[in-house]
C-alpha cells in the first residue's frame, strides 16, 4: 500500500480541529488495518503511542487523546484515512503516523508521517532586569514567555516622550528577549515595555528602570 | 485461465428488480476484491459497486448507493448485484471485474445486458 | 468525485503511425492511473496501470506516462488490431471514475 500525506507541516490554532489528511490506493480486503500513532517531538519513531486503530470494520480510539480522535471517513476504506483532532492542545506538537496494511499489498510499507504544530499565543510575559543602575553603568532587561508557538519574538520599547538613548547604547536580542542598556545616565530612567508576538497574538510585560547618581548606590 | 461469465440480465420495468450473477474461474475468488462496471448503450464505462475478498467491505458510488447491492459466496466462487428500484438510465450492459492489487480491473467478463423500459 | 477528461474524443490514424491520447484529472491522483481498450461488443482490457505499468501480454507499443493531473498514453506504431475505444480510469479514492474514452478509427 502506498499512503500520500502532504509534504508540508501541518499547523492549527490552540483548541481548532486538526485534519491530518491521509490517503492511499490499494483494493481494500478483509484484511484491511489502519493505525494512526504520535511521538512527541524529539522522540524516535520507535517510541510512537497508538491514538487509533481501524481493523475488522471496527474503530478504536486509544491512549489519552481518545475522546477527541475521530476518522473524516469511517470506515476509512474509500482510499482516504484522515485523522481528525478536535480541541488541540500544546502537547499535541508533535509527529503522526498514518499506516495502512491490506496484505497481500506490500507495494510500500504503508507509511506516512505528518508533523503537527499547535499554535499557541504568547502567554504574559515576565520582566525582569540585573546589572548596575547607577550612572555609567550598565544593566539587562530580560522578557520571557512561558508559552508560545512558534517561539515569540521580543520588543523592548521605551514608553513616554523621554529623549531617545543613542543607538550604540541600547541593543536588543529579539530571540532571547534581552535589552542590553550600556552607559546609563539618568535620562535612561522610565518604564520599558517588551512586547512578545508570534502570529497567533501578542502580550506584553512593563518594567521601571530607575538610575541613580554612582554614591547613592543601586536602586531598582 | 482468468474467467469471468455473467447472467441475469434481461428486461425489466421501472421501478423493478433484477439480480445479476457471475460466475468466477482460473483464480483464487476468496482472495480477490470484485466489481461491477456498467456501460449504457453507446456510452463509457462506469463503475458501480465493490466488494472486497471476504465481503466486510462494499462501497458504491451515489448514482446508485441504497438501490444496489453487492455481495458474493466465496464457496461458490460466484459474486452477485441485487439491483432495486430500476430506472431508465440504469438500462446498460453490466460487467463483472476482477480488480487488481490497486483497484484497477484487469479481468473482465463478457457482460450481460439489463434494460430498464416499460 | 475526481472527474476524468480525455481528449480527443475520436481520432483518425494509419497503421503504423504514432498516436497519443491525453487524459487529465480534476485533481492530483499521483500515478493512480489505468488505462483500457476496447473493441465493438466486447469487454475492456486492462492495458496499463500505475500510469506506465504494462501487465504480461501487453505489447511493448503501448506505453504510459503522466503524474499528477495529467496523463497520456501512446501507441507507437499503430496496428490493424488497435483501431478501438480507449479509456483511462483513475485507481486513487472512491469512486473510482473512467474518462469518456477516446475512439481511435482508420483514417
Known amino acids: 500500500v502506498e499512503v500520500k500525506v502532504p509534504t508540508e507541516p501541518l499547523s492549527t490554532p490552540l483548541g481548532k480541529t486538526a485534519e491530518l489528511t491521509c490517503t492511499y490506493s490499494t483494493s481494500v480486503g478483509d484484511s484491511f488495518a489502519l493505525e494512526w500513532s504520535f511521538v512527541q517531538p524529539g522522540k524516535p519513531i520507535s517510541e510512537s503511542h497508538p491514538i487509533l486503530y481501524f481493523t475488522n470494520g471496527h474503530l478504536y480510539p486509544t491512549g489519552s487523546k481518545s475522546k477527541r480522535v475521530s476518522l473524516l471517513q469511517n470506515p476509512p476504506t474509500v482510499g482516504v484515512a484522515t485523522l481528525k483532532l478536535t480541541d488541540v492542545h500544546p502537547s499535541d506538537t508533535g509527529t503522526y503516523l498514518c499506516q495502512v496494511n491490506n496484505p497481500p499489498d506490500f507495494y510500500t510499507n504503508g507509511l506516512g508521517l505528518i508533523n503537527l504544530t499547535v499554535l499557541v499565543p504568547p502567554s504574559n510575559p515576565l520582566c525582569s532586569q540585573s546589572g548596575q543602575t547607577s550612572v555609567g553603568g550598565s544593566t539587562a532587561l530580560r522578557c520571557s514567555s512561558s508559552e508560545g508557538a512558534p517561539k515569540p519574538v521580543y520588543n523592548w520599547v521605551r514608553l513616554g516622550t523621554f529623549p531617545t538613548p543613542s543607538p550604540g547604547s541600547m541593543v536588543q536580542d529579539e530571540v532571547s528577549g534581552q535589552l542590553i542598556l550600556t552607559n546609563l545616565s539618568l535620562t535612561s530612567s522610565g518604564t520599558y515595555r517588551c512586547v512578545a508576538t508570534n502570529q497567533m497574538g501578542s502580550a506584553s510585560c512593563e518594567l521601571t528602570l530607575s538610575v541613580t547618581e554612582p554614591s547613592q548606590g543601586r536602586v531598582a | 485461465e482468468v474467467q469471468l461469465v455473467e447472467s441475469g440480465g434481461g428486461l425489466v420495468k421501472p421501478g423493478g428488480s433484477l439480480r445479476l450473477s457471475c460466475a468466477a474461474s482460473g483464480f483464487t475468488f476468496s482472495n480477490s476484491g470484485m466489481s461491477w462496471v456498467r456501460q449504457a448503450p453507446g456510452k463509457g464505462l462506469e463503475w458501480v459497486a465493490s466488494?472486497?475478498?471476504?465481503?466486510?467491505?462494499?462501497h458504491y458510488p451515489d448514482s446508485v448507493k441504497g438501490r444496489f447491492t453487492i455481495s458474493r459466496d466465496n464457496a461458490k466462487s460466484s459474486l452477485y448485484l441485487q439491483m432495486n428500484s430500476l430506472r431508465a438510465e440504469d438500462t446498460a450492459v453490466y460487467y463483472c471485474a476482477r480488480q487488481g492489487v490497486q483497484p484497477f480491473f484487469d479481468y473482465w467478463g463478457q457482460g450481460t445486458l439489463v434494460t430498464v423500459s416499460s | 468525485d475526481i472527474q476524468m477528461t480525455q481528449s480527443p474524443s475520436t481520432l483518425s490514424a494509419s497503421v503504423g503511425d504514432r498516436v497519443t491520447i491525453t487524459c487529465r484529472a480534476s485533481e492530483n491522483i499521483y500515478s493512480y492511473l489505468a488505462w483500457y481498450q476496447q473493441k465493438p461488443g466486447k469487454a475492456p482490457k486492462l492495458l496499463i496501470y500505475?500510469?506506465?505499468t504494462l501487465p504480461e501480454g501487453v505489447p511493448s507499443r503501448f506505453s504510459g506516462s503522466g503524474s499528477g493531473t495529467e496523463f497520456t498514453l501512446t501507441i507507437s506504431s499503430l496496428q490493424p488490431d488497435d483501431f478501438a475505444t480507449y479509456y483511462c480510469?483513475?485507481?486513487?479514492?472512491?469512486?473510482?471514475?473512467f474518462g469518456q474514452g477516446t475512439k481511435v478509427e482508420i483514417k
Open positions: 466488494i472486497s475478498d471476504g465481503g466486510l467491505y462494499t
Open positions: 480510469q483513475h485507481h486513487y479514492v472512491i469512486p473510482w471514475t
Open positions: 500505475n500510469a506506465e
